[in-house]
């Protein structure tokens, strides 16, 4: 049998080392050796690819070596398959070199700063020394920040000029670090070279990009004055090495400047003592180069009646987030401000907050929120200045069994009755959301019986139980991960009722 | 449509010179690789020389090697071969010729030249 | 440095097929391809085969080239004969030797009435 035509030829020249081509079939049935067949020099020369005996054999590739390897030109290649059977021919296939020079990455020697230029880096390289001189070579700069994953890309040319290289970067982030890699190609080639190694390159600093302002409102105190706790940080968007050196805070109640009072402080947070009117708070960020844009905020009066307009929310996992989606009855609302901190028995101790735009849901990954811990999430509706009444919702991210079971004590004990009452479990341990309780009871070498109960129910009265008889019971609380038991309780039935 | 026409040929004494044209029409000259191919009295085709397509390079059959000299110009779209010493057996019609991949997929008409005393 | 040789004539009848051989000296009749020419009495030769088997377009289909490793040699065939393919062949290759092209000696075809 004739060996199979070669196929699927595919060519390149690397710049000043080879110019190979590849084949298929890669593997033939029989022993099968080949030759390629090149014309070179416009046409004008021939030559076969110089592999020895030993390589030949099955082996889909061949590379014409240098000084044979004129640039510019247009090659014809021929592969030819010979086997014990006889010979096959490809057909003719036609290379124009320029357009599969595959040449050397560049090499980034420096990303830096202009002095006073902001937002910008200037990239300098060195051009390929395994390159054409006279060529235009094509570039593509990729360029990410540091901290994230999804690169960009941009793409010019440059003429041959020096070796030495430099293209100006602009509209990027203040203050921010960039990785950047540097690949190029003749103008004319199909193929790029390889990436350069990574250089990492920081944009120049500048006066705080912006805050994003919030409060959680408490109870008035007995003298009638109402603490609010202000909370300030970066704005979505601002660089991730922007430091302040402090904030000024400055406040007065509505249509009365004269009675601002001001603070400055270096912390994100502060509480403020305010009176029942409506007050105005504005905080400004600063560094050595300037402030940063005014966060205002507007504290309603005591007595003042919030909008309400979120009808329903919803929490769902996916496989790697926790979505919460409401819906609203207002279409003007499309701010919306998500608090969550953990639901603890004591004070929480984080407290997490961040605006939303345009949507009516917010995600977070997993695992930014500890598992096993319930989250308190209330969204407020923002319109402008005003911010409506929240809508609040529970959530975990993972559920696991509760760490305890109920504690449970059996009160009015009768001839064949019990009452079982139990204790909520403490949130710090639930593990999730309690779904039901099971109370299981035994007599003295008797059947085990259940019931479940729904996890409102904190007490259950046991009927049709044996006079005189000992009884053992716990009571099981299960989350959707499973069931933990509580402590096992004795108790014995009368053998006489007070009416008998 | 391709065109080679020759120019220059005639009667020439033993020793002497003689500068033969080819003047090219109907394809872009300077990406062709170029040649002279002579054919004497009832005799074979016998290649004399080649260029590459800037010129940079040429090619001679070892009996013209230090003798003739084949040039372009591009510009003027005109290939050139410069016999000087010529002998009685450069006694040929010169053909101007254009390589395709290995072959000469065009001819000119061919100019005599005539080497005697 | 390899020689083509070629008979010095063939000759065939009006409408039969004929071959004219073209026996490569040394190394491997693969390793370059072969060309046909065709040269009417003072004409210019025109090709007719390329590349050990492609015709131009404007060539009729009776002629065809073909190469033997066994013989190492290549082939110009004609079929159906006719008046008009009276004329000297000449097979022509690459010799990387002399860097530069090899033609045979030509042959001479006559067409018989």
């Known amino acids: 049998v004739l060996p199979a035509k070669p196929e699927n030829i595919s060519c390149i020249f690397y710049y000043e080392e080879n110019f190979t081509c590849t084949w298929s079939p890669e593997k033939e049935a029989s022993y099968t050796w080949y030759k390629v067949k090149r014309t070179y020099s416009y046409g004008y020369k021939s030559d076969i690819c110089s592999t020895d005996n030993s390589t030949r054999g099955n082996h889909a590739s061949c590379s014409f070596l240098p000084p044979t390897i004129t640039n510019p030109d247009n090659y014809t290649i021929q592969v030819e398959a010979q086997n014990a059977d006889g010979i096959m021919k490809s057909d003719i296939t036609y290379w124009n070199l320029d357009a599969i020079m595959k040449i050397e990455p560049p090499e980034i020697f420096s990303v830096k700063s202009v002095l006073g230029i902001k937002r910008m880096l200037q990239i300098k390289w060195i051009r390929p020394v395994l390159a054409p001189h006279s060529s235009t070579l094509k570039y593509t700069l990729r360029f990410r920040t540091i901290n994230s994953a999804y690169w960009m890309e941009v793409n010019f040319t440059k003429e041959d000029i020096d070796r030495d290289e430099t293209y100006n970067l602009t509209e990027l982030q203040a203050f921010t670090e960039y990785v950047m890699t540097l690949r190029c190609a003749p103008a004319e080639s199909m193929f790029w070279s390889g990436w350069s190694q990574e250089k990492v390159g920081t944009t120049e600093e500048e006066a705080p990009y912006g805050l994003d302002l919030w409060r959680v409102l408490k109870p008035a105190m007995v003298d009638g004055r109402r603490p609010v706790q202000l909370m300030w940080k970066k704005a979505t968007g601002a660089p991730v090495l922007e430091k302040a050196l402090g904030y000024n805070i400055w406040y007065f109640p509505e249509n009365n400047t004269n009675l601002t009072e001001t603070v400055n402080t270096t912390n994100q947070t502060h509480e403020l003592y305010l009176g029942g009117k409506t007050y105005w708070v504005y905080v400004v960020s600063y560094n050595s180069l300037g402030e940063s844009p005014v966060a205002t905020l507007r504290i309603p009066a005591l007595n003042e009646k919030t909008f309400q307009c979120i009808e329903a929310m919803q929490a769902c996992l996916t496989q790697d987030q926790l979505v919460v989606e409401w819906q609203s009855s207002a279409p003007e609302v499309d701010t919306w401000m998500v608090e969550w901190f953990p639901d603890v028995d004591s004070e929480p101790s984080s407290f997490s907050w961040e605006s939303v735009s345009q949507a009516r849901n917010w995600t977070i990954q997993k695992d930014e929120l500890k598992p096993l811990w319930c989250y308190n999430i209330s969204v407020y509706p923002v319109l402008r200045d005003r911010v409506g009444q929240p809508y609040s919702t529970q959530a975990y991210v993972q559920e696991g069994i509760p760490s305890a079971g109920p504690v449970t004590q059996a009160d009015s004990i009768g001839v064949k009755t019990v009452t079982i009452t139990w204790k909520e479990i403490p949130k710090s341990k639930r593990n999730g959301f309690i779904k039901n309780y099971t109370i299981f009871y035994q007599a003295e070498d008797g059947k085990e019986f259940s019931k479940t109960v729904n996890s409102n129910i904190l007490q259950y009265r046991l009927e049709s139980l044996t006079r005189r008889t000992s009884y053992s019971l716990q009571v099981m609380a299960s989350t959707n991960a499973g069931g933990t038991n509580g402590t096992k309780i004795n108790f014995k039935t009368l053998s006489i009722s007070v009416l008998e | 449509e391709v065109q080679l026409v020759e120019s220059g040929g005639g009667l020439v004494k033993p020793g002497r010179s003689m500068k033969l044209s080819c003047a090219a029409s109907g394809f872009t000259f300077s990406n062709y690789y170029m040649a002279w191919v002579r054919q004497a009295p009832t005799k074979g085709l016998e290649w004399v020389a080649s260029?590459?397509?800037?010129?940079?390079?040429?090619y001679y059959r070892d009996s013209v090697k230090g003798r003739f000299t084949i040039s372009r110009d591009n510009a003027k779209r005109t290939l050139y071969l410069q016999m000087d010493s010529l002998r009685s057996e450069d006694t040929a019609t010169y053909y101007c010729?254009?390589?395709?991949?290995?072959?000469?997929?065009?001819w000119g008409q061919g100019v005599m030249v005539t080497v005697s005393s | 440095q390899f020689t083509l040789t070629q008979p010095k004539s063939v000759s065939g009848s009006l409408r039969s097929t004929i071959t004219i051989p073209c026996e490569r000296s040394s190394g491997d009749i693969g390793d370059s391809y072969v060309s046909w020419y065709q040269q009417h009495l003072g004409r210019p030769p025109i090709n007719v085969i390329y590349v050990d088997d492609q015709r131009p377009s404007e060539v009729s289909d009776r002629f065809s080239g073909s190469i033997d490793s066994s013989s190492n040699s290549a082939s110009l065939t004609i079929t159906d004969l006719q008046m008009d393919d009276e004329a000297d062949y000449f097979c022509?290759?690459?010799?990387?030797?002399?860097?530069?092209?090899?033609f045979g000696g030509g042959t001479k075809l006559t067409v018989l009435g």
């Open positions: 022509q290759s690459y010799d990387s030797n002399i860097d530069g092209p090899v």
């Open positions: 260029i590459s397509t800037g010129g940079g390079n040429t």
């Open positions: 010729g254009r390589h395709g991949t290995l072959y000469f997929d065009y």
